[in-house]
Amino acid sequence: GSERTCCPVNWVEHERSCYWFSRSGKAWADADNYCRLEDAHLVVVTSWEEQKFVQRHIGPVNTWMGLHDQNGPWKWVDGTDYETGFKNWRPEQPDDWYGHGLGGGEDCAHFTDDGRWNDDVCQRPYRWVCETELDKASQEPPLL
């Protein structure tokens, strides 16, 4: 495939990545699928600088990110190592509260109204952010 050298229309470029900010709300799995169909992934936050950038764009609304623990340990959707990576949880989060009886606890992470992270029931209809890296090979065939 060809390398992506500029961001798609309506995406925002920042530090060699492209970001798309939803306006509507979806469950985490639907948001994850939406990003994948755009040859992207739910946003993976790797630094305080990226955290601040995303926060500026989403405002005070719960917004899904690409972090979940649906299979056990917390994982970023692009494979970025969770344990050694950037974290910005609210105090006493993630609490993976099992009291809701959904089987797996609160398995999906989102930005809260102050930007810090919380884990919540993945079916909640929150906004989401897609991210794709510039210079990565796209799925599209090269133009001849």
């Epitope: 306006r23 709300g25 469950a27 609304v61 809701h100 009886g101 919540d120 029931v121 909640r124 209809p125």
Partner: antibody, heavy 120, light 107 residues
């Protein structure tokens, strides 16, 4: 104090249209999601639609999808429900209600309701 | 859509009685459940949210519990003004859905 006042109800023939309004006061309207909920005579409550605080997200009950449109004018502190292709089963008291947050946090304050009767 | 089943659909009780109403959902909803009170000819009034959190101004005789699929509303000591119809509602996801209601009548 926080207040919601609905208007626009009345008697209308099947297939016709009606627009309901909900005037909000006593709170910062533009920071809250808003809902419409209805109640048919002698029946329980049925959620109709939601619109997020900034109008960016709208969701509808299947029973009204494609016929009803929820909207808001934050400059006028007013919520609307445009009802087209009305049916007899749309006969109900229509309440507007405030979301506790931007649009996904449940209902706290309700208006007094406005009655819509669809009859030939 | 998430189905909400309330029980009983009606009950008769006396002033001072402790009353419990249950609400069961067709799938887990966390604690995203609210309870409302409605009197004849009036708009519903919000009592509790997040299953157990009391709305501002609601007396502490009302309490809620539960999570997942099973929830209860309890009125610790029924007063004349509490005779009304009570509804549960889930707001975990759209469409929001209500229970069928429980009418609390005077015995």
């Amino acid at each position: 104090q926080v207040q919601l006042v609905e208007s626009g109800g009345g008697v209308v023939q099947p297939g016709r249209s009606l627009r309901l309004s909900c005037a909000a006061s006593g709170f910062t309207f533009s920071t809250y999601g808003m809902h419409w909920v209805r109640q048919a005579p002698g029946k329980g409550l049925e959620w109709v639609a939601v619109i997020w605080y900034d109008g960016s997200n709208k969701n509808y009950a299947d029973s009204v999808k494609g016929r009803f449109t929820i909207s808001r004018d934050n400059s006028k502190n007013t919520l609307y429900l445009q009802m087209n292709s009305l049916r007899a089963e749309d006969t109900a008291v229509y309440y507007c209600a405030r979301d506790q947050g931007v649009g996904y946090d449940g209902l706290d304050v309700w208006g007094q309701g406005t009655t819509v009767t669809v009859s030939s | 859509d998430i189905q909400m089943t309330q029980s009983p659909s009606s009950l008769s009780a006396s002033v001072g009685d402790r009353v419990t109403i249950t609400c069961r959902t067709s799938q887990g909803i966390g604690n995203y459940l609210a309870w409302f009170q409605q009197k004849p000819g009036k708009a519903p009034k919000s009592l509790l949210y997040k299953a157990s959190s009391l709305q501002s101004g609601v007396p502490s005789k009302f309490s809620g519990s539960g999570s997942g699929t099973d929830f209860t509303l309890t009125i610790s000591s029924l007063q004349p003004e509490d005779f009304a119809t009570y509804y549960c509602q889930q707001y975990m996801t759209y469409p929001l859905t209500f229970g069928g209601g429980t009418k609390v009548e005077i015995k």
